[in-house]
C-alpha cells in the first residue's frame, strides 16, 4: 500500500512538475509575471523549481527504499521457513574502557658519559650537602683516571626520586626481593561480546544458586539443599587484547621504615661548592698542556686558612646504606580507568547448578523413560547414537542410582537435542567427563531419543 | 554446619564382621551421598563406596565388593557399614563423609571410629 | 584405578614462607581434584575444590590450579597452624582415588 502511495504521489508531482513548472511559459499568469516584474519572476521560478526538483529526487529515493523494503519482504527466507543465508557482520562495537594500569617499565639506560672538564682550582671545603637519593644501577661506565681521593662528605637526606628513566638494557640479576602482600581484588572488567558457543568444557563440580530459572515442571516439595559448588571452569577463552595503560593509582601511604638495603652504585657527583677565600697565592707556574693525572703529591704545608666557604651545593649521595626490611604494604591505589574489553573467549560450558538442583533426570517415571540433560538453562535430550549400558550406568549414578540399562524407543521428546554419541566407559562419575559430541550438535531426530532405566 | 556423629572404637577378630554408624545431622539426609573411607595409620586414604540416601543407590570401589555393605535409616539421618570377614591389615581409622553429588568433594567429615582386627 | 602421585612425602618451610604441593593422575581427570588438609589426630579437611575453588572459609593463603594431569596446592605465607598432611583427590572416575600425602613441616 505505501508503495502504492508513493508510486501515485510520484506521478502526480511530476504532472504538477511538468505542467506547473516547464510549462509555464504558455500560461497567461506566466507571461503576466515575466513582462510585470522580469528579474522578480525569474528569481522566484528558479527557486520554486529547486524545491520541486529536490522533493521529486525525495519521492524517488523513497520508492526506491520501499521498493527494497518489499523485495526484503517478499524475499525473505524465513517468510517461507527457509532459512536465510548470514548476514554480514555487524559493525566494529565501541572501544571498550581503559585498561588497569600497566606495570612500570624497567629503568631506562644509563646517561652517556660527559667529556671530563678542565680542572678547576680547589675551593674550600663545603659543608656536606645532604644525601642524594640511591641512582638507578647504570652500566659500568669507562674506567676513568685515578683522582686523589677526596674527604668524605657527612651523609646526605635523601634527594627527590628522579623522573622514570626510558627503558634500559637489563641489569645485572639482582638479589630475590621479599614477597609482597597481594593485591587486593581488581574490579569486574566489562564483559566481552557474547562469543560463539565454545566446545563444552568440563562440567565443575555445583556452582553456588543461580539467579531464579523459568518456572519449571511441578516436582515433589523437597527441603531446601546446602549450597552447591560453582562449575568448572570452561576451556579457557583467547587472550583479550591489551587494554591501554590506566592512569596510575594514588600513592599508597608510606610502608614502615625498612632495614638497610644493599649498597647501590654511587650517584653522581653533586656540583662543586662556591669557592673559599682562596690563601695566599703561590707563584704561578706557565701552564703546560694538561697531562694525565699525577700520583698525588706530597702534602703541602697548610697556608693559613682562609675565611670559611659559603656553603656547598649538595654533595655526591653517599653510599646506599644496607637494604631495609619490606615495608607494610600501603594502602590500594584508586583503581586505574577500565582497559578495553577484550574479544570474547570462546564460551565453556556451563557449571553445576547450585543447591540441590539435578542435571539429569528421567521423563517418564522415577527411573525409567527418556534421559535428558540440563544445559544452557533448557532441558534437552540424548540421542540413541552409541548409547549403551556403560552410558546407562554413569547417567543412573548421576541420580544416585548404582545400575543402569539403556532403553530405546522410549518416546520423542521435544526441543534440544543436547548430546549425541555419547560414549562412557562407565566409570566416570559424570556424563560430562565422557567422550561425547560438542552440545548441540547431532545429527538426529527425536524419534532417536535416549533412555534409561536405573535401578539400585 | 553439618555434622556427622561416628560410633566408638571396635576390637574385633579376625574373620568376624562390624558394622560402623554414622548420625548425621544439619544437612537434607536424603538429598546427599555418604561415603566411607579407610585410613591406615600413617597412610593414605581408601575410598570405599557412596550410598545415596535418596535411593539407597549404591557404588562400590570393587575392591571392597562383597565385604562392605552400605545402608542407611532415613528416619534417624543415619547410615552404617557392616564390613565383614574382617583381617588385620583392616586394622584402621574409617570415616564417613559427605558429598551433594557423586562428582562433588566430601566437604563433611566424621571424626572416625578406630577398628582393630587381632586375635 | 587413577593413580594419583604426591612425588614430595615432606616439604620443610619456615612461618611466611611460600610451599606449592604438586599431585599428578595417571590420565586426564579434568579439573575434577579436591585437595584436604589432615592435621594430627583429626578428620580430614576440604580446602580446594573442582582444582582451583577455595571452599568456603579457607584462608586465602592457600590456593590450587592445574587441570588435566597436573595439580598444584600452593600456601603462601605459611603459618605454624598449616602443620599437617596434605591430600589430592580426584572424583572424576570411579573409584575415587587419592594421593600418598605431603607433610609439612615448619622449621
Known amino acids: 500500500v505505501q508503495v502504492l502511495n508513493l508510486q501515485a504521489r510520484l506521478r502526480v508531482l511530476e504532472m504538477y512538475f511538468l505542467n506547473d513548472t516547464l510549462a509555464a511559459e504558455d500560461s497567461p499568469s506566466f507571461s503576466l509575471l515575466q513582462s510585470a516584474h522580469p528579474g522578480e519572476h525569474l528569481a522566484q521560478g528558479a527557486s520554486r523549481l529547486q524545491v520541486l526538483q529536490a522533493q521529486l529526487t525525495w519521492v524517488r529515493v523513497s520508492h526506491e527504499h520501499l521498493l527494497q523494503r518489499v523485495d526484503n519482504f517478499t524475499q525473505n527466507p524465513g517468510m517461507f521457513r527457509i532459512k536465510g543465508e548470514q548476514g554480514a557482520p555487524g559493525l566494529q562495537g565501541h572501544k571498550g574502557a581503559m585498561g588497569m594500569p600497566g606495570a612500570p617499565g624497567p629503568p631506562g639506560p644509563p646517561a652517556e658519559k660527559g667529556a671530563k672538564g678542565a680542572m678547576g682550582r680547589d675551593g674550600a671545603t663545603g659543608p656536606s650537602g645532604p644525601q642524594g637519593p640511591p641512582g638507578v644501577k647504570g652500566e659500568a661506565g669507562l674506567q676513568g683516571p685515578q683522582g686523589a681521593p677526596g674527604k668524605q662528605g657527612a651523609t646526605g637526606t635523601p634527594g627527590p626520586q628522579g623522573e622514570k628513566g626510558s627503558k634500559g638494557d637489563g641489569g645485572l640479576i639482582g638479589p630475590k626481593g621479599e614477597t609482597g602482600t597481594k593485591g587486593e581484588k581488581g574490579d569486574l572488567g566489562l564483559p566481552g561480546s557474547k562469543g560463539d558457543r565454545g566446545m563444552k568444557g568440563d562440567a565443575g563440580v555445583m556452582g553456588p544458586p543461580g539467579a531464579q530459572g523459568s518456572k519449571g515442571d511441578f516436582g515433589r516439595p523437597g527441603p531446601p539443599g546446602l549450597a552447591g559448588f560453582p562449575g568448572a571452569k570452561g576451556d579457557q577463552g583467547q587472550p583479550g587484547l591489551q587494554g591501554v595503560p590506566g592512569p596510575p593509582g594514588a600513592v599508597g601511604h608510606p610502608g614502615a621504615k625498612g632495614e638497610p638495603g644493599s649498597a647501590g652504585s654511587p650517584g653522581r657527583a653533586g656540583l662543586p661548592g662556591s669557592p673559599g677565600s682562596p690563601g695566599a697565592t703561590g707563584l704561578k707556574g706557565s701552564k703546560g698542556d694538561t697531562g694525565l693525572q699525577g700520583q698525588q703529591g706530597r702534602k703541602g704545608e697548610s697556608g693559613v686558612p682562609g675565611p670559611a666557604g659559603v656553603k656547598g651545593e649538595q654533595g655526591s649521595p653517599g653510599l646506599a646504606g644496607p637494604k631495609g626490611a619490606p615495608g607494610q604494604a600501603g594502602q590500594k591505589g584508586d583503581q586505574g580507568v577500565k582497559g578495553s574489553s577484550g574479544e570474547q573467549g570462546v564460551k565453556g560450558e556451563k557449571g553445576e547448578r547450585g543447591e540441590n538442583s539435578v542435571s539429569v533426570r528421567i521423563v517418564g517415571s522415577s527411573n525409567r523413560g527418556r534421559a535428558e540433560v540440563y544445559y544452557s538453562g533448557t532441558w534437552g535430550t540424548i540421542c540413541d547414537d552409541e548409547w549403551q549400558n556403560s552410558d546407562a550406568i554413569v547417567f543412573c549414578r548421576m541420580l544416585g542410582y548404582s545400575k543402569g540399562r539403556a532403553l530405546y524407543k522410549v518416546g520423542a521428546g521435544t526441543g534440544q537435542i543436547w548430546l549425541d554419541n555419547v560414549q562412557c566407559r562407565g566409570t566416570e562419575s559424570t556424563l560430562w567427563s565422557c567422550t561425547k559430541n560438542s552440545w548441540g550438535h547431532h545429527d538426529c531426530s527425536h524419534e532417536e531419543d535416549a533412555g534409561v532405566e536405573c535401578s539400585v | 554446619q553439618g555434622q556427622m556423629q561416628q560410633s566408638g572404637a571396635e576390637l574385633v577378630k579376625p574373620g568376624a564382621s562390624v558394622k560402623l554408624s554414622c548420625k548425621t545431622s544439619g544437612f537434607t539426609f536424603s538429598s546427599n551421598y555418604i561415603s566411607w573411607l579407610k585410613q591406615k595409620p600413617g597412610q593414605s586414604l581408601e575410598w570405599i563406596a557412596w550410598i545415596y540416601a535418596g535411593t539407597g543407590g549404591i557404588t562400590y570401589n570393587q575392591k571392597f565388593r562383597g565385604r562392605a555393605q552400605l545402608t542407611v535409616d532415613t528416619s534417624s539421618s543415619t547410615a552404617y557399614m557392616q564390613f565383614s570377614s574382617l583381617t588385620t591389615d583392616d586394622s584402621a581409622i574409617y570415616y564417613c563423609?559427605?558429598?551433594?553429588?557423586?562428582?562433588?568433594?566430601?566437604?563433611?567429615w566424621g571424626q572416625g571410629t578406630s577398628v582393630t582386627v587381632s586375635s | 584405578d587413577i593413580v594419583m602421585t604426591q612425588s614430595q612425602k615432606f616439604m620443610s618451610a619456615s612461618v611466611g614462607d611460600r610451599v606449592s604441593v604438586t599431585c599428578r593422575a595417571s590420565?586426564?581427570?579434568?579439573?575434577?581434584v579436591g585437595w584436604y588438609q589432615q592435621k594430627p589426630g583429626q578428620s580430614p579437611k576440604v580446602l580446594i575444590y573442582s582444582a582451583s575453588f577455595r571452599y568456603s572459609g579457607v584462608p586465602d593463603r592457600f590456593t590450587g590450579s592445574g587441570s588435566g594431569t597436573d595439580f598444584t596446592l600452593t600456601i603462601t605465607n605459611v603459618q605454624s597452624e598449616d602443620l599437617a598432611e596434605y591430600f589430592c583427590?580426584?572424583?572424576?572416575?570411579?573409584?575415587?582415588?587419592f594421593g600418598g600425602g605431603t607433610k609439612l613441616e615448619i622449621k
Open positions: 590420565q586426564n581427570v579434568v579439573t575434577n
Open positions: 563423609a559427605r558429598h551433594v553429588r557423586g562428582y562433588h568433594p566430601m566437604d563433611y
Open positions: 583427590q580426584q572424583y572424576n572416575n570411579y573409584p575415587y582415588t
